[in-house]
Amino acid sequence: EEELQVIQPDKSVSVAAGESAILLCTVTSLIPVGPIQWFRGAGPARELIYNQKEGHFPRVTTVSESTKRENMDFSISISNITPADAGTYYCVKFRKGSPDTEFKSGAGTELSVRAKPSAPVVSGPAARATPQHTVSFTCESHGFSPRDITLKWFKNGNELSDFQTNVDPVGESVSYSIHSTAKVVLTREDVHSQVICEVAHVTLQGDPLRGTANLSETIRVPPTLEVTQQPVRAENQVNVTCQVRKFYPQRLQLTWLENGNVSRTETASTVTENKDGTYNWMSWLLVNVSAHRDDVKLTCQVEHDGQPAVSKSHDLKVSA
């Protein structure tokens, strides 16, 4: 009789996370009598996956009916595979004894787990920035395997080139993470813009995952101010308007000063929105000319989104 061989025909098996892995093993002889055990890894630190003789292995089932006469098939199925299950699995024949002793091992089957990357999460800078400034966006995705992955950045459908990407860890691991930082130059038209991080991986069957960030969360467009004097509405009254244009976000407080003294403060409410997503607002002030002997300096002072105030002044001539 030829000496028993343990045959593991598959050098490697690749399984998607959540599915079952079938690991094949047959022996070529009924001799010697003794159980089969499956291990992950080799050496003293190997992990017992299944023991035909004893133990409870809720995720493992035998593919064939191992109690049946002349059974020489000791293939197993491992359910609900996760990246942590990756490794090399050995089918090992033991010889009956007290205790049973290892007789012969198969060559091993390497199990690799295909795990989908998590949905990319894009985050922008903590503080808003103004047009012409460069801001950084980060994109992170985790838990994927194998390591090969492609990440692209887009702004409004246009691919970006100024970014740096790292996949960690560098060495072998059960799963991997990707981290990318892209630099984006803001323009005044970016209120409606989107930055998109796109991740392509073998597990996604050509349907990449996307994470987005709206530049409306990042950009601050400071207003332009224009103060104009309107024709007299009534005797001794002059209407002065302050046009606040092209600002974003909406949070804005306007203060009128007459010769440096606060006349009125108001918060932007009924604004009009421009096509590019910025806002316009207008405030007016009725000045009683008869109350003034001298010329009046009117100042429209605007505090936008918590930034230092900007102002525009207008000299109101008081004629004798």
Partner: antibody
Framework: QVQLVQSGAEVKKPGASVKVSCKAS????????INWVRQAPGQGLEWIAM????????HYNQIFKDRATLTTDTSTSTAYMELRSLRSDDTAVYYC????????????WGRGTLVTVSS | DIVLTQSPDSLAVSLGERATINCRAS??????????IFWYQQKPGQPPKLLIY???NRDSGVPDRFSGSGSGTDFTLTISSLQAEDVAVYYC????????FGQGTKLEIK
Amino acid sequence: QVQLVQSGAEVKKPGASVKVSCKASGYTFTNYWINWVRQAPGQGLEWIAMIDPSDSETHYNQIFKDRATLTTDTSTSTAYMELRSLRSDDTAVYYCAMDYGSLYAMDYWGRGTLVTVSS
Amino acid sequence: DIVLTQSPDSLAVSLGERATINCRASQSVRSSGYNWIFWYQQKPGQPPKLLIYLASNRDSGVPDRFSGSGSGTDFTLTISSLQAEDVAVYYCQHSRELPTFGQGTKLEIK
């Protein structure tokens, strides 16, 4: 280590039934066949039947097919052999034995249960 | 059914001498490349103990003075050098079909 612990001796009257138990430990009960063998006083070994606890598949010696019933309780890892319509020549030591290689052999044995049938 | 016949029924051998027990099957017990014959030793008041499986393979812990041989219908259990603790009844069993035992051979010291 594998252990098969059998129930205690029984004395039965002719025509009665007996149910012998065999509690297994030291291995996964559902992974190996259990055989039942008897030995009358001063006589040889006589195979009665075998059962696969994983699915209750059974094989019986034709001599015992109508009188013996093998069952298992996987929750307690216990095998049972019931013999009905007892006769005086059923007086014997009844053994359970585990088949470790699925070869229809008997690798590990219980210590036996003496069943005495007497009026 | 396959019937196993052992010979002799009893045997007396001197300590250190060779003991040979035969088992003949009424038809071949060879199948799938294996001879489905097993040998057991039973000492008084004890259950049987498996010695040899598939005709020629010693079970774990069995001293190497015990050996099994044969093929097809004729099989032999040999004890190369009889020891006092080998006094027992020896049984052959087949499992080519459902198991049956031979009638047993009583081995004693001469």
